[in-house]
């Protein structure tokens, strides 16, 4: 699988989609769930409803939210409120039985708010904000990894 | 543990002028915005005036504009409050408290002082 | 500038009973783009300074005991003590940290019964 990026920005909703073979995948569950390193298991984070016919309904875990188009063949995977611990390797999984198959290996990138002072200092109030409401990038930006890049650093 | 301790509170004549100092410690003060809020005797609490981090940004109520001056000294964590043309109406305990702030959370007031009483009369 | 209204004034509750504050803003202190309210709650009890309880009108500070939560939205709230013990007497205001100025509600005392 290649990975794909999904760029999103720190505050901001992230919205990261898997597409699959409906037929294929037909009467699975779906899951998103963490990379922890290169080797690593993949970490649950959330899933869909444990009745596959009720998969279009929304499941949410803490910031995370998770909804299956199974007619469609799309999973959709939420992040509310990015932050920069959000940034990382993820996959989209199909269930069958205590197996998981690979939809999508994803990155996920989190960029800075370009509203961001970031500074506890500052004086910041969002009453004075709401006039650049336009300059907040609600969709995600996704791209595929290209030969050669690296997709986790190397380890020492 | 945070610790912000007012000084220069006392009586004034109407016209007159005070100097409040809000000495620091504790914590990283010349990161984190300031505030001072007023308390009248028996009412309630009115905000100042508020400093961010690195003097950069004021910001005033209007019942004190042109009258009173915040400023900071990082090096020495302290808050300042310049109280020009004092009137009777500012007779309060006035309370520094450091701000948390930064983008997501705006101004609220996590650590208070035990306040300064300014008593203005003739 | 925007005008908090806290009702009532004071209030007087059984010890284990609930207390209700409520607080009413001018405008909406709503920020669309990450759907928070930015409507906060302090407690002075006597002689001492305000300690803040919540923010983000339903976010507890942390140590707050869990009989504190706020509620609302938009421009209407309430800051409930689910089970009211002594040392919750004091006065209660809520405060605005949408916009500059910043605005405090004219307090509620809280009393036992």
């Known amino acids: 699988h290649n990975t794909t990026v999904f760029q999103g920005v720190e505050g901001q909703s992230l919205q990261v989609s898997c597409p699959y073979d409906s037929m294929k995948h037909w009467g699975r569950r779906k899951a998103w769930c963490r990379q922890l390193g290169e080797k690593g298991p993949c970490q649950r984070v959330v899933s869909t409803h444990n009745l596959w016919l009720l998969s279009f309904l929304r499941r949410r875990n803490g910031s995370t939210a998770i909804t299956d188009d199974t007619l469609g063949g799309t999973l959709t995977i939420t992040l509310r409120n990015l932050q920069p611990h959000d940034a990382g390797f993820y996959q989209c999984q199909s269930l069958h039985g205590s197996e998981a198959d690979t939809l999508r290996k994803v990155l996920v990138e989190v960029l800075a708010d370009p509203l961001d002072h970031r500074d506890a200092g500052d004086l910041w109030v969002p009453g004075e904000s709401e006039s650049f409401e336009d300059a907040h990038v609600e969709h995600s930006i996704s791209r595929s990894l290209l030969e050669g890049e690296i997709p986790f650093p190397p380890t020492s | 543990e945070v610790q912000l301790l007012e000084s220069g509170g006392g009586l004034v004549q109407p016209g007159g002028s005070l100097r409040l100092s809000c000495a620091a410690s504790?914590?990283?003060?010349?990161?984190?915005?300031m505030t001072w809020v007023r308390q009248a005797p028996g009412k309630g609490l009115e905000w100042v005036s508020a400093?961010?981090?690195?003097?950069?940004?004021?910001y005033y109520a209007d019942s004190v504009k042109g009258r009173f001056t915040i400023s900071r000294d990082n090096s020495k964590n302290t808050l300042y409050l310049q109280m020009n043309s004092l009137r009777a109406e500012d007779t309060a305990v006035y309370y520094c408290a450091s701000l948390r702030g930064g983008y997501e959370v705006g101004p609220t007031f996590d650590s208070w002082g035990q306040g300064t009483l300014v008593t203005v009369s003739s | 500038d925007i005008v908090m209204t806290q009702s009532p004034d004071s209030l007087a509750v059984s010890l284990g009973e609930r207390a209700t504050i409520n607080c009413k803003s001018s405008q909406s202190v709503l920020y669309s783009s990450n759907n928070k309210n930015y409507l906060a709650w302090y407690q002075q009890k006597p002689g001492q300074p305000p300690k803040l309880l919540i923010y983000w009108a339903s976010t507890r500070e942390s140590g707050v005991p869990d009989r504190f939560s706020g509620s609302g939205s938009g421009t209407d709230f309430t800051l409930t003590i689910s089970s009211l013990q002594a040392e919750d007497v004091a006065v209660y205001y809520c405060?605005?940290?949408?916009?500059?100025?910043?605005?405090f509600g004219g307090g509620t005392k809280v009393e036992i019964k």
């Open positions: 504790g914590f990283t003060f010349s990161t984190h915005a």
């Open positions: 400093i961010s981090a690195n003097a950069g940004k004021t």
């Open positions: 405060q605005q940290h949408y916009i500059w100025p910043i605005t």
